[in-house]
Amino acid sequence: VTCDDYYYGFGCNKFCRPRDDFFGHYACDQNGNKTCMEGWMGPECNRAICRQGCSPKHGSCKLPGDCRCQYGWQGLYCDKCIPHPGCVHGICNEPWQCLCETNWGGQLCDKDLNYCGTHQPCLNGGTCSNTGPDKYQCSCPEGYSGPNCEI
């Protein structure tokens, strides 16, 4: 039995006609099975295959090879969270966080908790002590005075 165009199988009871539109992107093999065009997958070949490495959790695509990030995520693979706007010395594990690096504090991680180490403000052999975010105190050796032992 010879089947009409686009019909396949025993009894010609399978239909497959190549298409490349909203409903699917496929060709047909000799048995009438849909074979997805490059970059497409799914039962109807209407699901794009995203860029290799694109985060399945935070990225998606409507066109093959693309990787569009969900709100709050960034990067080529949508695997990097976007920190809180204005976050200076901090990172995030989830979007909009600002987790401070060592020796930094405050909501935007812009307060220096180790002012002594970062700025070494005490002169003339003075001993520096961190007293709070962006605050320090110098203990001056005999013969020196002033906030930074500069006198």
Partner: antibody, heavy 116, light 107 residues
Framework: QVQLVQSGAELKKPGASVKVSCKVS????????IHWIRQAPGQGLEWMGI????????KYAQKFQGRVTMTVDTSTSTAYMELSSLRSEDTAVYYC?????????WGQGTLVTVSS | DIQMTQSPSSLSASVGDRVTITCRTS??????LTWYQQKPGKAPKLLIY???ILDSGVPSRFSGSGSGTDFTLTISSLQPEDFATYYC?????????FGGGTKLEIK
């Protein structure tokens, strides 16, 4: 087995909106598109639109453009059809259906009555 | 939009008769045509898809033919449960329009 279960009957006033749900079970929800079809009393079938359940993209018949919104909630395997600015001519049974090569599976239908 | 012209709009026949319903489209839809049966108060039931493929569980007395713009649904020997309304629909491109329906009544 595949099932599409729709929300109950609605009575609406002209100018209002209605939102009909279609909860799916028995297959992977995002594998198949959902279509919406309506049938006015004593009339034929009218195709309203289709939604790609994976992406949430929809295409509507010109007649309903601007008045209909089709959405999906993949977490609950539910499709929704909202029709706004209702008028008496929108009184109909609204069906959801699954398929690409015709509709092998249909919801039971939701009667929407628009009356003042 | 593709227009679907279904004929006849109504038809009286007897049990055992051979019945033919036709559907003509305004442009070539290849074989993207479906036939449905609907009984009062029920959702339509898929009979035939892609013009001639019988859906599973549909009796073999139903058959479909045609391609391009002219399609036919044939019931070879009418049974009492076949009295219903029949619709054709294309699924070639958006919008997927339906024919106007054919009401099949007992003579």
């Amino acid at each position: 087995q595949v099932q599409l279960v729709q929300s109950g009957a609605e009575l609406k006033k002209p100018g209002a909106s209605v939102k009909v749900s279609c909860k799916v079970s028995g297959y992977a929800f995002t594998d198949y598109a959902i279509h919406w079809i309506r049938q006015a009393p004593g009339q034929g079938l009218e195709w309203m639109g289709i939604i790609n359940t994976y992406y949430g993209d929809s295409k509507y018949a010109q007649k309903f453009q601007g008045r209909v919104t089709m959405t999906v909630d993949t977490s609950t395997s539910t499709a929704y059809m909202e029709l706004s600015s209702l008028r008496s001519e929108d009184t109909a049974v609204y069906y959801c259906a699954r398929g690409y090569d015709g509709f092998a599976y249909w919801g039971q239908g939701t009667l929407v009555t628009v009356s003042s | 939009d593709i227009q679907m012209t279904q004929s006849p709009s109504s038809l009286s026949a007897s049990v055992g008769d051979r019945v033919t319903i036709t559907c003509r489209t305004s442009e070539n839809i290849y074989s993207y045509l479906t036939w449905y049966q609907q009984k009062p108060g029920k959702a339509p039931k898929l009979l035939i898809y892609n013009a001639k493929i019988l859906d599973s569980g549909v009796p073999s007395r139903f058959s479909g033919s045609g391609s391009g713009t002219d399609f036919t649904l044939t019931i070879s020997s009418l049974q009492p449960e076949d009295f219903a309304t029949y619709y054709c629909q294309h699924h070639y491109d958006i919008p997927w329009t339906f024919g106007g329906g054919t009401k099949l009544e007992i003579k």
